[in-house]
């Protein structure tokens, strides 16, 4: 087991999963294409906590970056031993592992909040609410609520594909950054087995 | 004061069309949403649906799909409910209502009379 | 479509005293129920939304509550004005069905 390539895997995967956390993030402040609703303050309050943006964005980059440059060569060695250095850096992403699962898991929850909430809109009675908050989420199952919403067009469709998707790129960097303290510990203790002759792919 | 002008009253031959307007004045919310209504002679009240006049977004009772069709036009402020292959089941008074910050207001009826 | 049922159909009552209609709905519909009040020969009047949020304009002796199945309309001192039919409406997913009124006369 190479624990510095799997670590390069994970920083890369992380890299990809953040970027489309921002993207998924951003495109709930405009629903259906308009500002409007961003400019009048009708979005959904779980949509200000930026946990695409900040949790599982730009938060996620930090412990990505130090992943990917887990796997390179110029590592001093410490009292006469070259792996001393790897092994110190490998326990140390562990570190930078346990930041992402705090981001991935803001993101986790605001998402899965935001999806149980459901978003702001003005329904069919003129008025702004949280048209399903009553419903502890069973709206999520019942599809012909949605045309409570009169406006946004199509807001519930938006706010539950975002949110769902937030939820689970969350999810899967949950599940990376956890893989990376196992392999961080066992390749700090183990050792940083990899020579320059061996390859492995991600 | 908000007020909702509907147009008057109409006789109609079986099997014709009618549209129905519905004027809103004096609005200071600039999202409100339209519904339309349907009372027989001394009976109860029935939803046919709504239009948000800003989004296009429509909704319409299932059984009133092929009968109501609704429309909006945003720059003179008119919801229009288009009725066709009336019938004399179709003969009622037609409400416009419409909702907006906590305040929903009625229009006066239009009453339609499907007739030979 | 979901049945809304009010009860009684028609009742009498003196001003000054309270006054309660039922309105039971076939499903839970949460909270999703609007109140509405039409005199004779006049356009209905919106009066409640939200099983309990008082409609702009509309005086607080009235009050709505309930929820899930379950729902009544409060007139807590019956004044003359307050005569006509009363219409419960669920506004919980489409169509937005009525129920079939009470008929409120003053004594």
């Known amino acids: 087991m190479c624990y510095g390539k799997c670590a390069r895997c994970i920083g890369h995967s992380l890299v990809g999963l953040a970027l489309l956390c921002i993207i998924a993030n951003i495109l709930l402040y405009f629903p259906n294409g308009e500002t409007k609703y961003a400019s009048e303050n009708h979005l959904s309050r779980f949509v200000w906590f930026f946990s695409g943006i900040v949790g599982g964005g730009l938060l996620m980059l930090l412990p990505a970056f130090v992943f990917i440059g887990l796997e390179q060569d110029d590592c001093c060695g410490c009292c006469g031993h070259e792996n001393c250095g790897k092994r110190c850096a490998m326990l140390s992403s562990v570190l930078a592992a346990l930041i992402g699962i705090a981001g991935s898991g803001y993101c986790v929850i605001v998402a899965a909040l935001g999806l149980a909430e459901g978003p702001l809109c003005l329904d069919s009675f003129g008025q702004w609410n949280y048209t399903f908050a009553s419903t502890e989420g069973q709206y999520l199952l019942d599809t012909s609520t949605w045309s409570q919403c009169t406006e946004p067009k199509h807001i519930v469709e938006w706010n539950v594909s975002l949110f769902s998707i937030l939820l689970a790129l969350g999810g899967i960097e949950f599940i990376l950054c956890l893989i990376q303290v196992i392999n961080g510990v066992l390749g700090g203790i183990c050792g940083f087995c990899c020579s320059r002759q061996q390859q492995y792919d991600c | 004061e908000v007020q909702l002008q509907q147009s008057g009253p109409e006789l109609v031959k079986p099997g014709a069309s009618v549209k129905l307007s519905c004027k809103a004045s004096g609005y200071t919310v600039t999202s409100y949403v339209m519904h339309w209504v349907k009372q027989k002679p001394g009976q109860g009240l029935e939803w046919i649906g709504y239009i948000n006049p800003y989004s296009d977004v429509t909704n319409c009772n299932e059984k009133f799909k092929g009968k109501a069709t609704l429309t909006s036009d945003k720059t003179s402020s008119t919801a229009y409910m288009e009725l066709s292959s009336l019938t004399s089941e179709d003969s009622a008074v037609y409400y416009c209502?419409?909702?907006?910050?906590?305040?929903?207001?009625w229009g006066q009826g239009t009453l339609v009379t499907v007739s030979a | 479509d979901i049945q809304m049922t009010q009860s009684p159909a028609s009742l009498s009552a003196s001003v000054g005293e309270p006054v309660t209609i039922t309105c039971r709905a076939s499903k839970n519909i949460y909270t999703y129920l609007a109140w509405y009040h039409q005199k004779q020969g006049k356009s209905p009047q919106f009066l409640v939304y939200n099983a309990r949020t008082l409609a702009g304009g509309v005086p607080s002796r009235l009050s709505g509550s309930g929820s899930v199945t379950q729902f009544s309309l409060n007139i807590n001192t019956l004044h003359r004005e307050d005569l006509g039919t009363y219409f419960c409406?669920?506004?919980?997913?489409?169509?937005?069905?009525f129920g079939g009124g009470t008929n409120l006369e003053i004594k």
């Open positions: 409406q669920h506004h919980y997913d489409t169509p937005y069905t």
């Open positions: 209502s419409s909702y907006g910050g906590g305040f929903a207001y």
